[in-house]
Interface confidence: medium
């Protein structure tokens, strides 16, 4: 028998440095957890105890912090180069500054390779790309060899943008024969790495023949066998096994998301390739692992320039940003519309005709804007501004939500109105109408959309059995703020950009903004 | 190899403005800093600011704040800074350099152009 | 800022001899392990070139007569056996915090 210990991250997001328990923003350092210089602390523990070890990344690097926003993908390379990464797949993410964004800072600095056997390339692009991210790599182990055949979710055209030149296949579809390949070669250890979500990594080890083990990301999913360390409420075990149609026993991983844990999986394999047992756990990277000193004094002087950007003008309002509670959770509030405005901004994806784009509605609840901007100081608005505004480091996601849903959201958003809660919701290619005269659950009166299958937006009533998508920030889709509706009934969920970059981007482009309040949230009585 | 090949001097009026700009090559120039330096006869080298191509990000001296800008072209891979409202003690040899932050170096100015001599006179 | 304070302003020696350079930080420089302090050679009508980086790491292509020491505010430039084409201005530069800064120069004599 020979034995292979995998070591995965998956949806790092551009958490570099450690963060808190809720991995956001290092408050404590006794008892903040992850970050690159933790991560290789226990990577090299590791690897001078065990012979046969790789580390893996299933995707998803780009993203998350003012890291990101400022390197641009160049901080990805150089730490993961630094951390010795075996190989990498394409996560939806990594084409956030499109192709050109993932060609410079990662696809020709990574000295490691990067993955996605379902991502064609084709017209110009394809000689320019081409050598610089690959179906397959067949990496030599100790005495062995391991095939690690990579894969990106199919939805990426509509998360990200990764340009017209680049066709995203089915996965399993476009799997298959590059496993085939691997096995002609005479390779019969074969790791599909890839970033689809959890019910594609299981439909893989089900159907792709060949395959002995899946590493995924993308769902951010949480697996653990035993007593979990931390938060995270495990969805099954760690690892997850899957019979696949051919009968064999195929373990399936993931290492929830952030830097907060480094997956564990100890594989044995027989001399003909299959795997004979498999087991592990994620690893908590908490305080009680040392930060490795010569990679924090490479993040320390990463650092020295990320300060200087916080204080940067990124645009100028021409008008006061009324982020207050006294207004964003009582009525509509210019700062909430500002905030959707971007979010839809952020997410104009014309893939087809047919549709202006894919997504027209935001919501967002008001508590969850925390600071007004005052346009009196020059105008000024910079990352340090927004931060204010936006201090949780959250994201905005992509879900898609029946109308009887979203009817039920808005039911909540009022439900108890007048006591200055946070639920209230801030919206964008929406108007609602509440009557506050009629009893909890039963005060929405009007609710129209925006259309996207048009030329022309225009508003249409809501219609409780179509199927709409939406972006909200990633606390509202987890049923923050007691939308446990949204949560429950969700059909898809895709995590989006970190909140403040998507509003500086915004900013950014726009230069000069001057957001008012147009009437998108509006209280009547009476009948209708 | 590296190479930072700077635009040749100028002379300039009190008042006016001057650009000069940098040219790199031999390198990925979106992925380091490159940073302007200015040396007046007899004097210190004098940081002025640095710029990262690949997101436009720019950090600035104070004592220029107001009469500097640099900016950044990736399509030609080449690194501009505007100094305004010249005065006579702007005269100086201007100097771009590339900082080697994503190595060892950090921040380093591991490659230099051949400076630019930027005469101020009425 | 932080301001870097060179002594001497002039050195002479002849060939063969050692030369040792100081700079002073006003403020510490150091952190981690790691002193951004970096050090460079100029020559007349020449741009300058980067000796050492981070205080004590030599850099590519330049002749392990150079050498560097120092942490927190006290740092060395020490030229081992110096050569008639070491003649030139000596600058140190620091990066550990904005703006960063330059020492006003050592320049060295060769006899």
């Known amino acids: 028998a020979w034995e292979l210990t995998i070591l995965h991250t998956n949806d790092v997001h551009s958490r570099l440095e450690q963060t808190s328990e809720d991995s956001s923003k290092c408050v404590n350092a006794s008892r903040c957890m992850g970050g690159v210089a933790r991560l290789f602390t226990k990577v090299q523990q590791i690897r001078r105890a065990e012979p046969n070890v790789l580390l893996l990344d299933a995707g998803d690097q780009y993203q998350g912090t003012i890291w990101f926003t400022v390197y641009k993908g160049a901080e990805v390379a150089h730490f993961m180069n630094a951390l010795r990464y075996d190989a990498m797949a394409l996560g939806n993410h990594e084409f956030d500054n499109g192709v050109e964004g993932l060609i410079e800072p990662l696809l020709k600095e990574a000295k490691f390779p990067i993955l996605s056997a379902n991502i064609k390339a084709k017209g110009p692009l394809a000689s320019q790309i081409s050598g610089l991210y690959l179906p397959y790599k067949v990496l030599p182990v100790g005495d062995e060899v391991v095939g690690i055949v990579g894969y990106t979710s199919k939805e990426t055209p509509f998360l990200s943008n990764p340009g017209t030149n680049l066709v995203f296949e089915d996965e399993i579809t476009a799997l298959q024969p590059e496993v085939d390949k691997l096995k002609t070669l005479n390779v019969n250890k074969i790791i599909a790495l890839g970033h689809s979500g959890f019910e594609m990594d299981k439909l893989i080890a089900q159907k792709v023949r060949g395959v002995d083990v899946v590493v995924g990301g993308h769902s951010n999913t949480f697996l653990y066998t035993g007593n979990p360390p931390s938060k995270e409420v495990p969805a099954g075990k760690y690892p997850f096994i899957v019979t696949s149609d051919d009968g064999r026993k195929v373990p399936v991983v993931q290492a929830y998301a952030f830097g907060k844990y480094l997956g564990y999986l100890k594989i044995e394999f027989d001399e003909r390739g299959n795997v004979i047992s498999s087991h592990g756990n994620p690893i908590l990277l908490n305080s009680s692992i040392p930060e490795d000193p010569s990679i924090k004094a490479d993040i320390n002087k990463w650092r020295i320039k990320l300060d200087n950007y916080s204080t940067q003008e990124l645009g100028k309002t021409i008008v006061y940003l009324d982020g207050s509670s006294q207004s964003c959770r009582f009525r509509e509030c210019n700062m909430g519309n500002l905030i959707c405005d971007a979010m839809i901004n952020n997410n104009l994806r014309h893939t087809d005709e047919m549709f202006w784009n894919h997504v027209s509605m935001c919501i967002l609840n008001g508590g969850g804007i925390r600071s007004p901007i005052d346009e009196r100081n020059n105008g000024t608005i910079t990352w340090e501004n927004l931060a204010a505004v936006l201090p949780f480091g959250g994201t905005f996601d992509l879900v898609q939500l029946k109308g009887s849903t979203l009817k039920k959201a808005f039911e909540h958003s009022v439900h108890r109105y007048g006591q200055s809660t946070g639920e209230f919701l801030q919206v964008g290619g929406i108007h609602v109408v509440y009557d506050l005269s009629r009893k909890p659950g039963d005060r929405v009166v009007k609710l129209d959309v925006l259309c996207t299958k048009c030329r022309v937006p225009s508003y249409d009533p809501l219609k409780m059995d179509e199927v709409y998508k939406v972006i909200l920030p990633n606390f509202l889709a987890n049923g923050g703020d007691g939308f446990q509706m949204i949560k429950d009934e969700l059909l898809r969920h895709d995590s989006g950009d970190q909140d403040i970059n998507v509003v500086s981007t915004y900013i950014s482009k726009m230069k000069v903004i001057y957001p008012a309040v147009e009437g998108r949230i509006k209280f009547s009585t009476g009948s209708h | 190899q590296v190479q930072l090949v700077q635009s040749g001097a100028e002379v300039k009026k009190p008042g006016a403005s001057v650009k000069v700009s940098c040219k790199a090559s031999g390198y990925t120039f979106t992925s380091y800093w490159i940073t302007w330096v200015r040396q007046a006869r007899g004097q210190r080298l004098e940081w002025i600011g640095d710029i990262y191509p690949g997101s436009g990000n720019t950090n600035y001296n104070e004592k220029f704040k107001t009469r500097v800008t640099i900016t950044a072209d990736k399509s030609t891979s080449t690194a501009y800074m505007e100094l305004s409202s010249l005065r006579s003690e702007d005269t100086a040899v201007y100097y771009c350099a590339k900082e080697g932050g994503l190595t060892t170096e950090d921040y380093a100015l591991d490659y230099w152009g051949q400076g630019t001599l930027v005469t101020v006179s009425s | 800022e932080i301001v870097l304070t060179q002594s001497p302003a002039t050195l002479s020696l002849s060939p063969g001899e050692r030369a040792t350079l100081s700079c002073r930080a006003s403020?510490?420089?150091?952190?981690?392990?790691?002193?951004?302090m970096h050090w460079y050679q100029q020559k007349p009508g020449q741009a300058p070139r980067l000796l050492i980086y981070?205080?004590?790491n030599l850099e590519s292509g330049i002749p392990p007569r150079f050498s560097g020491s120092g942490y927190g505010t006290d740092f060395t430039l020490t030229i081992n056996n110096i050569e008639s084409e070491d003649a030139a201005y000596y600058f140190c530069q620091h990066s550990r915090e904005l703006p960063f800064t330059f020492g006003q120069g050592t320049k060295v004599e060769i006899k």
């Open positions: 403020k510490n420089v150091s952190t981690s392990g790691y002193s951004y």
């Open positions: 981070l205080a004590s």
